[in-house]
Interface confidence: medium
């Protein structure tokens, strides 16, 4: 049978031929009667055999990493007979490893993100190198990792390539680090080969910084004419963090939040100071408010960085605006008796300049020929007043600053003209009536009523009487009904159209004013010829008859 040992050939041998081993048949007695042959891939080119002895040689430099074993076939032939002495047999030549490959990092580039302020031991990333040498051949492919750059912040586990944090890092001081890792084979022993890789480690932000005001004092101004809601200025805090960790909220400390407010512009991260309540320079010309700023999002575990909110003082000066005069009252109502003489006192109005300058005020009454006003605000009559023409005056008073005539205020002025008893009562209409010739005594001729243009505090009460002459010598009499009316009655029987066609009766009407006023009013009575039926009459004046609607023949 065949006799051989396992065949090994070291890779990378530079000699022209390298003896690997011997193939032989146990029938071979060494007399050179056998011939050995090599068949298969590499036979003749990579490996040759001594046909007489069966010695195998490698005639080429081999690379295990390219091919680590060769499977060949061997034949042995009896030279004399040309027949195979042994059956053809397969055998293996293994290429043995030498440390001719350095470790290589195949997954480059390496990049990792880790939160800033992470504690020691936090895993960052694992790097892995590979070595093409034979892992089963000694230490040729056994690797050790070490840190060439990155101390003191990072460390690498020698056997796993796991990178860990070894010292806390602050993103606000440095936000990324380049770490260089070396992998050495031969577990670092002399003659080891090495490879390196770079790892970019970026620190992600955590909210470890509170916002801080850029200024300890801000100065702002607001006009006293500014409406509520006006933005009067901005304040700004800065936060070394980024993204949502730098989002902040501004507020006013409780005591100071009556007049102003602060809203946050979340795009610019500025605080906008807003006027919450109108200000008045003359009441308070400056304000001090204390503002504070806090982060919008602070996780519980990071509250230790945010114990005291940053504060700032805002000094707000109110700017004076020239304001129009201010009347003491929103409107004035005065009373004055009618018929008072020109120049009579009506009342006093008063306006003042609300500004600290206290400009003198000039007054005027718009569109009035009846009243005057002087620079003291005293109103007097410029004409006599007649309540029966106008009982109320609805006017407008204007106050103007002496040194700035554009500053004007106007308010309503109502003047009531009070009544005096300056009108006697009169007939409510013109009375003209008739009496029949055949009228009897006590016959009602006419009911009369009166009016008085004066205003009465109580109800008007009129008193009716005949004049003295008519009382003494009258064909008629009067009865006062006590209701501001009276009736005229005949005081005799029978009248004569031809002798006395018309009577003029003087009626006195007195009012109940103090003093009482009396007027004399004439009642005209025509004598008419009346038929028995009363359907036809003849009077002196046909017009009268027609106007009274009587039929005529």
């Amino acid at each position: 049978g065949w006799v051989w040992n396992q065949f090994f050939v070291p890779e990378e041998m530079n000699t022209t031929s390298h003896h690997i081993g011997q193939l032989r048949s146990d029938l071979d007695n060494g007399n050179n009667s056998f011939q050995y042959k090599l068949l298969g891939a590499g036979a003749g080119s990579t490996f040759i055999i001594d046909e007489r002895t069966g010695d195998i040689y490698a005639i080429q430099k081999l690379d295990r990493e390219e091919r680590s074993l060769y499977i060949l076939r061997a034949q042995v032939i009896d030279i004399a007979t040309g027949r195979a002495v042994e059956p053809e047999s397969e055998f293996v030549i293994k290429v043995s490893d030498i440390n001719d490959n350095e470790p290589k990092f195949l997954d480059e580039p390496y990049e990792a993100i880790v939160p800033e302020m992470s504690p020691e031991g936090t895993l960052v990333i694992q790097v892995t190198a590979s070595d093409a040498d034979d892992p089963s051949s000694g230490n040729n492919a056994r690797l050790l990792y070490s840190l060439l750059q990155g101390q003191p912040y990072f460390s690498v586990e020698p056997t796993t390539g796991v990178i860990r944090i070894s010292s806390k890092m602050d993103r606000e001081l440095q936000d990324e680090y380049w770490v260089i890792i070396q992998a050495k084979d031969m577990i670092g022993q002399p003659g080891a080969l090495s490879g390196t890789t770079s790892v970019l480690i970026k620190l992600s932000d955590v909210n470890d910084n509170k916002p801080i005001f850029k200024e300890s004092l801000y100065r702002l101004t607001v006009s006293e004419s500014a409406p509520t809601g006006t933005s009067i200025g901005t304040i700004m805090a800065y936060d070394n963090d980024i993204g949502e960790n730098a989002e902040m909220d501004y507020s006013i400390e409780e005591d100071d939040s009556q007049t102003f407010d602060i809203i946050t512009n979340h795009e610019t991260q500025e605080g906008i100071v807003i006027l919450k309540k109108k200000v008045d320079f003359e009441h308070q010309n400056h304000y001090g408010i204390r503002a504070k700023v806090k982060n919008h999002h602070v996780p519980e575990q990071l509250m230790k960085y945010h114990t005291e909110a940053s504060t700032t003082f805002i000094k707000i000066q109110v700017e004076d605006v020239d304001e129009p005069p201010l009347f003491l009252l929103p409107y004035y109502v005065f009373e004055v008796f009618e018929e008072t003489p020109q120049g009579s006192f009506v009342g006093v109005v008063s306006a003042t300049d609300p500004d600290n300058r206290k400009s003198p005020i000039r007054y005027s009454i718009t569109r009035s020929k009846v009243f005057n006003i002087n620079d003291n605000g005293t109103i007097t009559t410029s004409n006599s007043l007649d309540r029966e023409i106008s009982a109320w005056y609805n006017l407008s008073i204007t106050a103007t600053e002496k040194y700035n005539i554009e500053q004007i205020s106007s308010i309503p002025l109502y003047v009531q003209v009070l009544n005096i008893n300056d009108h006697a009562p009169e007939f409510s209409q013109y009375y003209e009536t008739y009496v029949c010739e055949n009228a009897g005594s006590g016959q009602v001729i006419q009911t009369i009523s009166a009016v008085d243009r004066d205003e009465s505090i109580e109800e008007h009460h009129f008193y009716f009487n005949l004049s003295v002459e008519d009382t003494n010598n009258s064909s008629f009499t009067i009865i006062d009904n006590q209701d501001n009316t009276a009736v005229i009655l005949t005081n005799r029987t029978g009248f004569n159209l031809q002798e006395e066609p018309v009577f003029y009766i003087s009626i006195l009407i007195a009012d109940n004013g103090i003093p009482s006023l009396t007027s004399t009013n004439t009642l005209t009575i025509h004598v008419c010829d009346c038929g028995d039926s009363g359907s036809t009459q003849t009077c002196q004046y046909q017009e009268l008859v027609l106007s009274m609607g009587f039929k005529t023949e």
Partner: antibody, heavy 119, light 107 residues
Framework: QVQLVESGGGVVQPGGSLRLSCAAS????????MDWVRQTPGKGLEWVAV????????YYADSVRGRFTISRDNSKNTLFLQMNSLRVEDTAVYYC????????????WGRGTLVTVSS | EIVLTQSPGTLSLSPGERATLSCRAS???????LAWYQQKPGQAPRLLIY???SRATGIPDRFSGSGSGTDFTLTISRLEPEDFAVYYC????????FGQGTKVEIK
């Protein structure tokens, strides 16, 4: 050291004028609002005027508005008070005072300069 | 304007005694914007207290301020010889006004 020194006081007739100066040293003058405060035996301490750190705003007490003018020269670290149309009641010791950075009280005062208005 | 009234006008005490000075405002002083000053003859006023109760830099802790709204107090716990002077309160919440002063004199 940190100090304020007033000068320019004196005796003046009613209707006359005076210009007071206040020299600042030892601190960043241009960062502070500055005031004038006067002291009379009758009325005690009375605030007169304030000027903001950069001169952009000036405010006066009612009693002096229109007659007094406050100004400053930050390049020379000096505060001024121009007093015109002086009245007898303006007689007082005039102090310049520094407002604090966070409020309106006065943390630094000068020694004062006496202004006497008399006929 | 806010009128500040100090009482008493004069306080006669001996060194080592406690001094209590009062300052009353005619209307509420916003956010306790009240300061106390000390003035010695021929000298400028010196800031003692601001914000009603905060001690100014370099002021000994025997000086303390309290109060809010309209009533404020300056207390000197143990009078030292150098504490005899005139004390003024000042409000700075609405313009600037001072009290008329309280003189602390040696008994």
């Amino acid at each position: 050291q940190v100090q304020l020194v007033e000068s320019g006081g004196g005796v003046v007739q009613p209707g006359g004028s005076l210009r007071l100066s206040c020299a600042a040293s030892g601190f960043s003058f241009s960062s502070y609002d500055m005031d004038w405060v006067r002291q009379t035996p009758g009325k005690g301490l009375e605030w007169v005027a304030v000027i903001w750190y950069d001169g952009s705003n000036k405010y006066y007490a009612d009693s002096v508005r229109g007659r007094f003018t406050i100004s400053r020269d930050n390049s020379k670290n000096t505060l001024f008070l121009q007093m015109n149309s002086l009245r007898v009641e303006d007689t007082a010791v005039y102090y310049c005072a520094r407002e604090t950075g966070e409020g309106w009280y006065f943390d630094l005062w000068g020694r004062g300069t006496l202004v006497t208005v008399s006929s | 304007e806010i009128v500040l009234t100090q009482s008493p006008g004069t306080l006669s005490l001996s060194p080592g005694e406690r001094a209590t000075l009062s300052c009353r405002a005619s209307q509420s002083v916003s956010s306790s914007y009240l300061a106390w000053y000390q003035q010695k003859p021929g000298q400028a006023p010196r800031l003692l207290i601001y914000g009603a109760s905060s001690r100014a830099t370099g002021i000994p802790d025997r000086f303390s301020g309290s109060g809010s709204g309209t009533d404020f107090t300056l207390t000197i716990s143990r009078l030292e010889p150098e504490d005899f002077a005139v004390y003024y309160c000042q409000q700075y919440g609405s313009s600037w006004t001072f009290g008329q002063g309280t003189k602390v004199e040696i008994k």
